[in-house]
Amino acid sequence: MPSATSHSGSGSKSSGPPPPSGSSGSEAAAGAGAAAPASQHPATGTGAVQTEAMKQILGVIDKKLRNLEKKKGKLDDYQERMNKGERLNQDQLDAVSKYQEVTNNLEFAKELQRSFMALSQDIQKTIKKTARREQLMREEAEQKRLKTVLELQYVLDKLGDDEVRTDLKQGLNGVPILSEEELSLLDEFYKLVDPERDMSLRLNEQYEHASIHLWDLLEGKEKPVCGTTYKVLKEIVERVFQSNYFDSTHNHQNGLCEEEEAASAPAVEDQVPEAEPEPAEEYTEQSEVESTEYVNRQFMAETQFTSGEKEQVDEWTVETVEVVNSLQQQPQAASPSVPEPHSLTPVAQADPLVRRQRVQDLMAQMQGPYNFIQDSMLDFENQTLDPAIVSAQPMNPTQNMDMPQLVCPPVHSESRLAQPNQVPVQPEATQVPLVSSTSEGYTASQPLYQPSHATEQRPQKEPIDQIQATISLNTDQTTASSSLPAASQPQVFQAGTSKPLHSSGINVNAAPFQSMQTVFNMNAPVPPVNEPETLKQQNQYQASYNQSFSSQPHQVEQTELQQEQLQTVVGTYHGSPDQSHQVTGNHQQPPQQNTGFPRSNQPYYNSRGVSRGGSRGARGLMNGYRGPANGFRGGYDGYRPSFSNTPNSGYTQSQFSAPRDYSGYQRDGYQQNFKRGSGQSGPRGAPRGRGGPPRPNRGMPQMNTQQVN
């Protein structure tokens, strides 16, 4: 019975000489009982985050599919042999008789696989979205907590001011906000959260204790403290917050900086300064003055700046409201104007008036198309974005081109008048804009943007301050960004409010300047509130932003420069030469691959901006102290990250996607510094229950920790 009999398709083969090598038949019987080993079908690559059940289902379907494919292949072979007149054995005949069934099963299995893969992808998307939402909620909660800490620090700080104490006791409308007893309680609590240095304890132990007190206060625990409970203390603090006492401008005499109009002069030849020995902390002013505006968010309605999740934004977050056009820099083109650069010496000035003058001059420069985005607003398809990352985009979707080299403008120092009511803010750490731009548009046809700096040589004792930010924006990124419909384009540079372009002044004394840690979010597009679909543009904004902050007015070795760039790292590093055009001093550096994590002499930003003056290690970690004039002084330690990132080492955003723990480590080279100067009052003494000389560091516990990898 030539297997003839084999009805179940027993493999007997054709009538002719049996086909070689066991191409036996009937195995093809539909349904193929035994799962054949894999053939043709690639494994269903569905994603890393796949539920186990889904993986198993897809695995089974895949196996079945491969089996059926194999079977169908055999049947096709049998069919062909039959057509040639060859005799098949019973197993083969049985198999062939099931051809239609096998074909149907195969189609069904394919359809099933497609469905499950789609389902799997949906599940993954949902998981990702949920995770992202949870992450955002965590970050938002964290940010709110941080905000509360900052507010608390600000209030506690201000309570050292006799005038503030008196105001709070008297109240705004005769109704006392705080009693003497409550002030005393806050004074006592202040000593817990900013304790005197106890040399018997390790510093981090001491601050650990302080942080526990802060935490318990934020939690409003019923635990006893300072003769009361954290809950009571929290209520007292909240009462102060709710009184809006610190919001009213009469309490903060604002030093207003005059606005400066940029004089667009015709081309002026670059003046290349001669190389001369200069102090390490010298900066060159950029050659074009721009009018920009630094908006004090404390005086803006919170609701004006909300994320897609309608989160409330910390009132002290900084937001740039208007955008001036991008700075156009033609290769070897002359600078439109040559302002008289002012000098900023790296050390604190003895004369408060001079210091005020310096501060005002720098504050006037605080303009630039940066939107300081709070982290909780970032709902982005890719990995969670780091808080200390800046997102730079073209100003509108139609401008599809590389970003130019963007440089901070200089200010005419002689145009400044000392303002008597100004708070003496340390000049070493002044908020400066990272980017400025001219009023001229530029087109995509200009592939290279070379800086033109016309500055005079300065005597050594008058070094010129300049911060240059070079942002290299991959053309792919701008293209991707521009290709989105205007409605869904995250308008990072667009004006957020209807404030005029040139504001009448800058509030130097407002709370944010004294207490708010500015976090730059670069490379983090804000998805429009109504258009979650933009989240799907996965690779849209993963550009390489190499931000270079040079402290040299003259050209130096490139390797040295690379170690002196701001530690702002985002996305996947693209080190190709055509993506990075560095501007350094008055010379254009040849494009080259920048290290992703270079060292910076200005490694962090706080509300006072880039700390100036202290050489590395000179004054420690921005440990401010109040001198007799109650002016804030502080040094900083340039932070050198312990991780390297050569262009090929592949640091991507996922390295930093874990929820931030500000107390435990340093994020991305930004020193989380919360030491603040106070207002104008005299040194805090007896009212705070601490006799003796004024205490250094009347601010929050030092939160300057080192980055860990």
């Epitope: 003839a4 009999t5 007997s12 197993d91």
Partner: antibody, heavy 114, light 112 residues
Framework: EVQLVESGGGLVQPGGSLRLSCAAS?????????MSWVRQAPGKGLEWIAY????????AYANWAKGRFTISRDNSKNTLYLQMNSLRAEDTAVYYC??????WGPGTLVTVSS | DIQMTQSPSSLSASVGDRVTIKCQAS??????LAWYQQKPGKAPKRLIY???NLDSGVPSRFSGSGSGTDFTFTISSLQPEDIATYYC??????????????FGGGTKVEIK
Amino acid sequence: EVQLVESGGGLVQPGGSLRLSCAASGFSFSGSYYMSWVRQAPGKGLEWIAYIYIGDGVTAYANWAKGRFTISRDNSKNTLYLQMNSLRAEDTAVYYCARGNKLWGPGTLVTVSS
Amino acid sequence: DIQMTQSPSSLSASVGDRVTIKCQASQSISSYLAWYQQKPGKAPKRLIYDASNLDSGVPSRFSGSGSGTDFTFTISSLQPEDIATYYCQCTAVSSATIYGNAFGGGTKVEIK
């Protein structure tokens, strides 16, 4: 239910003839099937006799069966036949019909004895 | 006719033992081979077709392998219900080169 039932067995004298039938039920003889006859002598192994392809009637025989045994089918009756001539004592066995090599009938006993 | 030689003709093994039966064809038959189990007084039951494919409903402890002239049938873990005689059969369609659907002599499997 698909099944095969053999009949026609019994006692026959040596040199005599016998015609075995195999009635198929549950499936039609019009399909692509090989129908076979297999026998098994008492206490011995299985021995293939012949097959016929229902579709076109092509047949094949074991060498020892050629000339004495004939396989045929009647598609209209859904029946398979085995004509045995010149029977010998050694032809005593249980005779099975099978469709392909998967479906077997229970068998019918043929005894050749004088 | 093609000749099929099966060995051993009988074997005795313990429950749980691995049992192997060989079948050799007098000429290459590719993979056109079936294995049967026959219990006393019953018709044979096919277990394996095309040398290695397990029939539906057959326990996975039964397996087959080989092609050409040498084939092997294995019971990975002998069970009491496996006591039977096992046969191999060439299932090729008769042709000028391969003729007949001969059976092997059978292997009687017993439990020790």
